[in-house]
């Protein structure tokens, strides 16, 4: 047959559904390759054909259509399972053609097993709720399109195994599940199980997503720098090495991009001829605040870079801040000649200057 | 380390009802949930039924409905397992078994509670 | 429900022996399946969840595989406090199902 624009195996759609619910699949060619819709194909006479290779299989084949039940269906540019099996797993492709035009797209369909407590191998939305923040909702998603507006489905809403009904904070409102106040307890997975009928059947959607608690935008503030500090005196002698930890505190802030970085006499480290390495750790607190540490370490400091001026800058969405370290070049204790020593009279050695810590 | 400890034996009479309980430490008895589980003497082990420790919602095998009830108490941190009109079969070991909300195997369990249905 | 078949139902070895023991269920339960020990007088401890995925601190010579409705449980060097009484769960469906057990006892 003749040439067909070939847009290969689309892995960015990796369609996860569940075994033994509907699932409506939309062909790729429509949203994200091609720049006019499906209505607009079929206007201009091109055909839609789907077809597919089983998991394991390299031959192409036919997908059937005459299923009992219609169990397996086109609409549109929609491919319809009512409901899937296990062995629809594979790979679908969705082909636009006429006899001028061909234009095709393959993608991975895995129909995934779950538990009884909606554990499965598919991947989750997670949904972030400020904590203590006032009341937020979550919604069911993914349903639109599988029943028309005159249905109206029962939704029942789980944590885990377990069905959400009376609770004091947690309250299912249809489509909706409504968090009155969120505490970090209420951090897990829910599944909205959609149960609506179509021809005499009944049929399941399950939704799982994860609630993540976060910190609450009415709590958050600027970058917090908790060293260098001004307790801090980093007292070296020329050629040991020189270890300067930068530790911020950032609040969460959603889609804030937290910065650290040095500056070594107002300019990056990289543009100083020394050699310096910075090594970075993250870790993060329940409600999803940040503390970023950067090291800046100089392996065998000279007189000269213990005279340099080393500032930490910490940036998040909350503003910038920045503080310098306290570098000294150590003053060596005096050294008593032996004879000096006799004439005082001195039993000990004279000690350095006091400070707060040394490092 | 997390531990669940039962309340002790039982002795009861065919017809009556028995309540044992099972306190667990060691661990946010919120984030879990609590199943319990017997085992008949000389016999394997049969589930029950299960509840959520935050949402007090129970799920119970078709065999016991309407017999148990299974409740938690989070101030105390305490589950609770009710059988009524017992009979002399369900003489056995009534065990509560933690887990996760979310979780299907069991993975901190009691010690045990032996009930005795005798006339 | 789901019934869930153990075999052997007595497994007569010696310390040091290779022990494989059996679970089948009536229905695929995917990988949704947990294996415990049970000791005399004692409450059961778990082994493996999720078909093959070991508990914690439960030591490496006790693996599990299988997938669908058959599972097995393998002890590769059984050691003198490995004898006791193992039984199989699945949590795919409700309510959730054990096996009638597998003794495994000194020879």
């Known amino acids: 047959s003749e040439r067909c624009d070939d847009w290969g195996l689309d892995t960015m759609r990796q369609i996860q559904v569940f075994e033994d619910e509907p699932a409506r699949i939309k062909c790729p060619l429509f949203e994200h390759f091609l720049k006019f819709n499906y209505s607009t194909a079929h206007s201009a006479g091109l055909t839609l054909i789907w077809y597919w290779t089983r998991q394991d299989r390299d031959l192409e084949e036919p997908i059937n259509f005459r299923l009992p039940e219609n169990r397996i269906s086109k609409e549109k540019d929609v491919l319809w399972f009512r409901p899937t099996l296990l062995n629809d797993t594979g790979n679908y492709t969705c082909m636009l053609r006429n006899t001028t035009y061909c234009s095709k797209v393959a993608f991975p369909l895995e129909v995934v097993q779950k538990d009884s407590c909606f554990n499965s191998p598919m991947k989750l939305p997670v949904h972030k709720l400020y904590i203590e923040y006032g009341i937020q909702r979550i919604t069911c998603p993914n349903v639109d399109g599988y029943f028309p507006s005159s249905v109206k489905p029962t939704i029942t809403w789980y944590m885990g195994c377990y069905k959400i009904q009376n609770f004091n904070n947690v309250i299912p409102e249809g489509m909706n599940l409504s968090f009155l106040i969120a505490f970090i307890s209420n951090n897990g997975n829910y599944t909205c199980v959609v149960t609506y009928p179509e021809n005499g059947r009944t049929f399941h959607l399950t939704r799982t997503l994860t609630v993540k608690v976060v910190g609450s935008p009415k709590n958050a503030v600027p970058p917090v720098i908790h060293s260098p500090n001004d307790h801090v005196v980093y007292e070296k002698e020329p050629g040991e090495e020189l270890l300067i930890p930068c530790t911020v505190y950032f609040s969460f802030l959603m889609d804030s991009r937290n910065e650290v970085w040095w500056t070594i006499d107002g300019k990056k480290p990289d543009d100083i001829p020394i050699d310096v390495t910075i090594n970075e750790s993250i870790s993060h607190s329940r409600t999803e605040d940040e503390t970023r540490t950067q090291i800046l370490s100089i392996k065998k400091v000279t007189s000269e870079d213990l005279k340099r001026s080393y500032v930490c800058h910490a940036r998040s969405a909350k503003g910038e801040v920045a503080k310098a370290a306290t570098v000294k070049q150590k003053v060596p204790a005096p050294r008593y000649t032996v004879e000096l020593a006799c004439g005082f009279g001195a039993t000990g050695s004279g000690s350095g200057s006091h400070h707060h810590h040394h490092h | 380390q997390v531990q669940l400890v039962q309340s002790g034996a039982e002795v009861k009479k065919p017809g009556s009802s028995v309540k044992v309980s099972c306190k667990a430490s060691?661990?946010?008895?919120?984030?879990?949930?609590i199943s319990w589980v017997r085992q008949a003497p000389g016999q394997g082990l049969e589930w029950m039924g299960g509840i959520s420790a935050i949402f007090g919602t129970a799920n119970y095998a078709q065999k016991f409905q309407g017999r148990v009830t299974i409740t938690a108490d989070e101030s105390t941190s305490t589950a609770y397992m009710e059988l009524s009109s017992l009979r002399s079969e369900d003489t056995a070991v009534y065990y509560c078994?933690?887990?996760?909300?979310?979780?299907?195997?069991?993975?901190?369990w009691g010690q045990g509670t032996l009930v005795t249905v005798s006339s | 429900e789901i019934v869930l078949t153990q075999s052997p139902a007595t497994l007569s070895l010696s310390p040091g022996e290779r022990a494989t023991l059996s679970c089948r269920a009536s229905?695929?339960?995917?990988?949704?399946l947990a294996w415990y020990q049970q000791k005399p007088g004692q409450a059961p401890r778990l082994l493996i969840y999720?078909?093959?995925n070991r508990a914690t601190g439960i030591p490496a010579r006790f693996s599990g595989s299988g997938s669908g409705t058959d599972f097995t449980l393998t002890i590769s060097s059984l050691e003198p406090e490995d004898f006791a009484v193992y039984y199989c769960q699945q949590g795919k469906h409700w309510p959730w199902t054990f096996g009638q057990g597998t003794k495994v006892e000194i020879k």
């Open positions: 229905q695929s339960v995917s990988n949704f």
């Open positions: 060691g661990g946010t008895f919120s984030s879990y949930a």
């Open positions: 999720g078909a093959s």
């Open positions: 078994a933690r887990h996760l909300h979310n979780g299907i195997h069991l993975d901190y």
